[in-house]
Every structure is written in C-alpha cells, then in structure tokens.
Interface confidence: medium
C-alpha cells in the first residue's frame, strides 16, 4: 500500500481551507476525547480509477468519495481520517484531511474525495472514513467503511496498468491442447517477445475427482529473437493410467519484470465422453475401477479409449 508519488495532495475547496497530512492511523482524539463530535460520513463510495505517475506509469487507485450529513455537527468537524486496510496482509495506510477553517452550511451538500491510494490487482481492501474528532468511548460511531475488491490482471482495463504489464499481462499465449492418443498430449502456445525460458506444468486428474493422478514439469529454453511471437509446440508423454484423463496444462513464463511471479496461463482438456449405451466389447473395461483399500490407478493398456481432439 502506498500513495501515488506525485502531485501536492489537495483537499481545499471553495469555502474550506484544508491540508492533507500523513497519518499514523491513531488520531489524537482517541487519546484525548472531545465532548462534542461530528456525525458520520454519508454515501461513502469507492471506485476504481487509474492515475499516471510523473514517470508515465499507470496505476490503479482507489477513488474515495463521501458527503456530509446536513446537521449542525459540521460546526464541530475538524477533518477526516481516511484508512485503507489490505485484508490479506493487514497492512494499513492512512491520511488525514485537516480543516484549517470552520465549515459553514451552504446550499449544496459538502462533498469530499481522494484518489491517491495505489491498490494492487486482485486484492481486497477495507476503506474507512472517520470524521474527526473521533467519538468518545460510548458515543455513536462517526465512521463509515466499505470493502473494495480490485479486479485482477485478466480485466481488460487492468491489463494495461504498470503492475499488470510487469507481471506479463500483455502476453496472450493462446494455448491449444490436443490429445494425440492415450499417452501423448500436444501443447501449442505463442511465445512472448523476450529471451526467457518457460515451464509447462501438467497436472492430470480422474474424470470426476480433484486429486491429481499424474504430474509432470517440462522446461522450454529461452527462444531466440527470430522465434518471438511464433508458435511453440511440445508433445508431452503421459503415464497411461486408467481413467487419468482430465489434463490441466499451465504455462509459467519467467519474464525479467516478474521472474518467478509472472502470471500463468492454463488450459484444460476434458475426459473423452463415454457413449450413453456402449456397444459390448469382449474385453471392455470401465474407464476406471474403484477398488477397496487402494487409491492407485491400474497401469494397463487402455484398450477401450478413442482419440478425441480438444482445442482450447
């Protein structure tokens, strides 16, 4: 969590002299309670906006907006504390609007906004606006909170932000996976424009289960410049395990901007559909046989399987 690196942070508006300050998230009014405190914010809205840094980078930011209630407590409103909590890390960042003049009623409702908290793709935040001074221990709360979920890098508008591009969001491998036979899987994908290696992670599952029955990792060396944006194809050898027929292929790039933490792309090939009323075959066997006391899969030749081609 951080604040956007440029622009003097402004909260002044006609009729109000105001300054934005860094905050420890522990306002003085917690320690020294006041007798008279303002009411809570009204209509807190959080939206995703995008902002450029001075360096030209584009970042997603939380746009926080709220209004004041139309009561006399605005006469005791000295400012506001804006707090953003990242839920998966418990990291918190606060800023304080400090009013340098007293608010007066006017015909239009007072409205405030702040768009300088940089947020991360796919992360969830709790945004809180506290009016200051904060209430006495038994007083009515004068804050409002909302949770805010930032779209991940799959979202078209997020893809072009600097943090997403740094993790490889612009690379579209357009993976196709094809079962050649019961023991071979062909994977095709488009290489990116960087001399970096890739890893293909194959995980196979039984038809209706989520416990893997086969795993394999395949290393693809860094392409030469003339191979950038070209299709690469790899044939993977499967273990011919009875019923181990649903394959998930994941491609992990190792781009210089994200190293081991680049966005991965995956494709899945389903088990071949069994006919509703299969014709009897002398040595016909079910796709997989549950056996008491054992969870391994029979390593026989799959005489009953047909070749299905699946494109993703």
């Amino acid at each position: 969590l951080r604040l956007l690196d440029h622009r003097a942070l402004v909260c002044s508006q006609p009729g109000l002299n105001c300054t934005v300050k860094n905050s420890t998230c522990l306002d003085d009014s917690w320690i020294h309670p006041r007798n008279l405190t303002p009411s809570s914010p009204k209509d807190l809205q959080i939206q995703l906006h995008f902002a450029h840094t001075q360096q030209g980078d584009l970042f997603p930011v939380a746009h926080i907006e709220w209004t004041l209630q139309t009561d006399a407590s605005i006469l005791y409103l000295e400012g506001a504390e804006l707090s953003v909590l990242q839920l998966n890390t418990n990291e918190r960042l606060c800023v304080k609007f400090q009013f340098l003049s007293m608010l007066q009623h006017h015909r239009k409702r007072w409205r405030f906004s702040f768009s300088h908290f940089v947020v991360d793709p796919g992360q969830e935040y709790e945004v809180t606006v506290h009016h200051l001074p904060k209430p006495i221990p038994d007083g009515d709360p004068n804050h409002q909170s909302k949770n805010f979920l930032v779209p991940d890098c799959e979202h078209a508008r997020m893809k072009v932000t600097t943090p997403c591009m740094s993790s490889g969001s612009l690379w579209d491998p357009n993976i196709t996976v094809e079962t050649l036979d019961t023991q071979h899987l062909r994977v095709d994908f488009t290489l990116w424009n960087e001399s970096t290696h890739y890893q293909i992670l194959l995980t196979s599952f039984p038809h209706m289960e989520n416990h893997s029955c086969f795993e394999h990792m395949h290393h693809i060396p860094a392409p030469r410049p003339e191979e950038f944006h070209q299709r690469s194809n790899v044939t993977l050898t499967l273990r011919n395990l009875k019923g181990c027929c649903r394959h998930q292929v994941q491609i992990q790039p190792f781009f210089s901007s994200c190293l081991n933490d680049c966005l991965r792309h995956s494709a899945t090939v389903s088990c071949p559909e069994m006919p509703d009323t299969p014709e009897p075959i002398p040595d016909y066997m079910p796709l997989w046989e549950p056996r008491s006391g054992s969870s391994d899969y029979k390593d026989d030749d799959d005489k009953g399987s047909s070749h299905h081609h699946h494109h993703h």
Epitope: Q45, L48, K146, F148, P151, E154, V160, D172
Partner: antibody
Framework: QVQLQESGPGLVKPSETLSLTCTVS????????WNWIRQSPGKGLEWIGD???????NYNPSLKSRVTISVDTSKNQFSLKLSSVTTADTAVYYC?????????????????????????WGQGTTVTVSS | DILMTQSPSSLSASVGDRVTITCRAS??????LGWYQQKPGKAPKRLIY???SLQSGVPSRFSGSGSGTEFTLTISSLQPEDFATYYC?????????FGPGTKVDIK
Amino acid sequence: QVQLQESGPGLVKPSETLSLTCTVSGGSISNYYWNWIRQSPGKGLEWIGDIYYSGSTNYNPSLKSRVTISVDTSKNQFSLKLSSVTTADTAVYYCARDGELANYYGSGSYQFYYYYGMDVWGQGTTVTVSS
Amino acid sequence: DILMTQSPSSLSASVGDRVTITCRASQGIRNDLGWYQQKPGKAPKRLIYAASSLQSGVPSRFSGSGSGTEFTLTISSLQPEDFATYYCLQHNSNPFTFGPGTKVDIK
C-alpha cells in the same frame, strides 16, 4: 444525461488523414474511457481504439499504425486521427463512452463486481473516402 | 483477437414470438459481454451488460444469459419495435470485438 456528438469532414481524399472530434456534453470526460467505433456500409461494427481521460490509449492492432486518439479535458472533447486512408475506410464513425466502472453491492457493504462496456453512443457521422 | 460468432445471421419472426440469439466467443471471456440493438440509420443501443444484467430503461422482455464462451439473448415476446439487428460485444480483452450481427425481421 451525457450526450456525445461527432463532428468532422464528411469527405476525405485517399492517402489523406481523417480527423474527427467527439464532444461530451451533460457530464464530465474525467474518470471514463472513451471509444471510437466504425461501421462500414452493410458491414458489422469494428472497435478502433479508446482513450482514458488521463491520455492513456489502447488501439486495435489492425489499425494501430494509422490511428491516433487524443483527449482535451478542458474542452470535454476527444479526437480521432486516421492517416493514409483508402476507400476501405469509408464508414459511419461512432464515439462511445465506456460505462462507469460500476461497483455492484452484495450483502452488506461488499463491493464485488466491475463492469465496463459501451453504454452511451454518439449518433454517428458518415465519412466517405473518395477522390 | 477474440472472434465472436452469432447465430442465426438472420431470422423472421412474428409479433409475440419468443426469439433467441446465440453469441459464441473463440475463447473464454467470463461475463464481459454486452448485447446491442441497432436500427437502420441509428447508433447501437445497449440492452444487456455483464452478460445478464438489464440496462436501465430497457423492457424486461429482453434477457441475457451465459458465461465463458456461450451467451444468449432472449426476447420473450417480440414487439413491433424490436425488429432490428442485434450485436454482441466482448470487452474482455483488446481489441474489443463485435459479433457479425443477427437481423430480426417480420415474417
């Protein structure tokens, strides 16, 4: 109620540059993406590109080498320039706003879904490329 | 690019008919899809956003469904003003792409 109005010459000569402006009225250009789309006679719709109010652009790769989209927030306008035009660029050109990045509320105060998509369109302007 | 296909390309129907139009994406687009109606000489008008949400002011006879690669627009009871061309639009990834359109005319 936000309204969009395209303007620009209706006739452009081959090899010249097509220039169109879209004026936004009834609302601010800030905090939205703004798109250009075209529709050739009797054909479907083709997205040309878009611009965020801050100036960040995205272009259709098929037109990228010829397209420039710019924005003037002070005039509440954004513009399209398409260079080296041919008769294939004859079309109705539309400007459109990408819908607000909406926050849909689930239970309590949880904001959980984001949606963009072109919700407000101009009425379109016909551009003919001919000598 | 994500290729959007629509079926049928045209259909003839009568007032009161139930009409279904299908849009398929060449790869998964979650629910990042809108449905648009266009009448001759007019700009497209959005009917459905997020694959299934009804645009404000659009009659409830229009509905959308689907996710991933297959999407459907349904008009539960066709009205005279519904004769038009319908397009789907994916905005999951750049370039955004439209379907080729489905023309609905009077039987």
